[in-house]
């Protein structure tokens, strides 16, 4: 939702969290603002306090329940409002009718581990976190490997077009330190975006055996 120079963007993690960012040029830093969530068909509502993340933007997380509980479904619509205190009154600064499963951003994958490492290849697995059972297997992943002397931005992206929570990295250099990251995205949702990248997993390939090419 955009009003003039105001921007209000929220994502649902598919379980029990809606994260919101509100930015407004010229807003006062010390103003007290909140996000209010009112589902259209549920008995609960929720509020979070917007905290500054930069000069003109604020963020907060609406915690709807325990991390793995399915608090919203595919047919829910949530009215989200930014409310700011002006003296003794609250003023509405932004509003949107939010369809949670059209605006998804999952949690970053977790539990990255090296399953098997050789001189030229490495098998890595991970788990998805707090993802709805609704997606069945209809998720995709992107992965990247950081090579020595390069930046993450230079790393080519590898795409896994199905729910595959492992990868076999090939053509690696022996006895070399690498880092690996992965992110996840459901197919569902017009405004759905990639999860944050996972924490990097560091690993080292095995040295080449002397006198033979492995």
């Amino acid at each position: 939702a955009v009003n003039g120079t105001s921007r209000f963007t929220c994502f649902y993690n598919s379980r029990a969290n809606i994260s919101c960012v509100w930015s407004q040029d010229g807003a006062l830093q010390d103003t007290s603002c909140q996000v209010h969530a009112w589902p259209d068909r549920r008995r609960w509502n929720q509020t979070c306090e917007l905290l500054p993340v930069s000069q003109a933007s604020w963020a907060c997380n609406l915690i709807l329940g325990t991390p793995d509980s399915q608090k919203l479904t595919a047919v829910d619509i949530v009215t989200l409002r930014v409310m700011c205190r002006e003296g003794v009154r609250w003023r509405m600064m932004a509003i949107q009718d939010f369809k949670p499963f059209e605006n998804l951003r999952l949690m970053a994958p977790i539990s990255l581990q090296v399953v098997h490492v050789e001189t030229h290849r490495c098998n890595i697995s991970w788990k998805i976190s707090q993802a709805s059972h609704y997606f069945e297997r209809h998720l995709e992943f992107e992965a990247r490997t950081l090579s020595p002397g390069h930046t993450w931005e230079e790393a080519p992206l590898m795409t896994l077009k199905q729910k595959q929570e492992w990868i076999c990295l090939e053509t690696l250099t022996p006895d070399t330190q690498y880092e690996f990251q992965v992110r996840v995205k459901p197919l569902q949702g017009e405004f759905t975006t990639w999860s944050p990248w996972s924490q990097p997993l560091a690993f080292r390939t095995k040295p080449a055996a002397l006198g033979k090419d492995t």
């Epitope: 059972h133 609704y134 017009e190």
Partner: antibody, heavy 117, light 107 residues
Framework: EVQLVQSGAEVKKPGATVKISCKVS????????IHWVQQAPGKGLEWMGW????????EYAPGFQDRVTITADTSTDTAYMELSSLRSEDTAVYYC??????????WGQGTTVTVSS | EIVMTQSPATLSVSPGERATLSCRAS??????LHWYQQKPGQAPRLLII???QSISGIPARFSGSRSGTEFTLTISSLQSEDFAVYFC?????????FGQGTKLEIK
């Protein structure tokens, strides 16, 4: 292998109630959605509703809301669809199907219900 | 309720030829459109999700595309087992609704 096996054909009188079962195997029933769909003779498909076994919630299409009840027994991995106040236009094949909320990935073989006086 | 209109109602095509089936939504549904195939006496089978994503195990000759509110299912080279009824279904607005179907028959 994912399988949904439905109960057999039924013949009912107008005003009666029918209850169809859908026994599933090959996936975790407790973390699934089971949909029900009606297909009247020579007509298209009509989505009736679903049960979300994890969330313990049901969702019904407005056209069926007053007469349909979807339930599940997680101890036997079986879903049920009960349709009450039957009329002749309820004569149809009824399907259960597994999926996410948005589409139906695996279907049962269908149960024919005939409503006739 | 969103109305899904499929055209044509019946399509006659020779084996080996290309078949193009259309599905139009009465309002914008983003990419929330799914295709099913139904053969006589059988349950429907899911073919394509979100307008263009093929389901694993479905032959590569089946493909989907979208232009605004119009969605197209294309079968590039018809096999004998492809002659069936095809349904589209939207999942953008509750309740989910199906098109009335296109019957694909042998010419």
């Amino acid at each position: 292998e994912v399988q949904l096996v439905q109960s057999g054909a039924e013949v009912k009188k107008p005003g009666a109630t029918v209850k169809i079962s859908c026994k599933v195997s090959g996936f975790n029933f407790k973390y699934s959605l089971i949909h029900w769909v009606q297909q009247a003779p020579g007509k298209g498909l009509e989505w009736m509703g679903w049960i979300d076994n994890e969330a313990g919630e049901t969702e019904y299409a407005p056209g069926f809301q007053d007469r349909v009840t979807i339930t599940a027994d997680t101890s036997t991995d079986t879903a049920y669809m009960e349709l009450s106040s039957l009329r002749s236009e309820d004569t149809a094949v009824y399907y259960c199907a597994r999926g996410g909320p948005w589409f139906l990935s695996y279907w049962g073989q269908g149960t024919t219900v005939t409503v006739s006086s | 309720e969103i109305v899904m209109t499929q055209s044509p109602a019946t399509l006659s095509v020779s084996p080996g030829e290309r078949a193009t089936l259309s599905c139009r939504a009465s309002q914008i549904i983003s990419n929330n459109l799914h295709w099913y195939q139904q053969k006589p006496g059988q349950a429907p089978r899911l073919l394509i999700i979100y307008g263009l994503q093929s389901i694993s195990g479905i032959p590569a000759r089946f493909s989907g595309s979208r232009s605004g509110t119009e969605f197209t299912l294309t079968i590039s080279s018809l096999q004998s087992e492809d002659f069936a009824v095809y349904f589209c279904q939207q999942s953008n607005n509750f309740p989910w609704t199906f098109g009335q179907g296109t019957k694909l028959e042998i010419k």
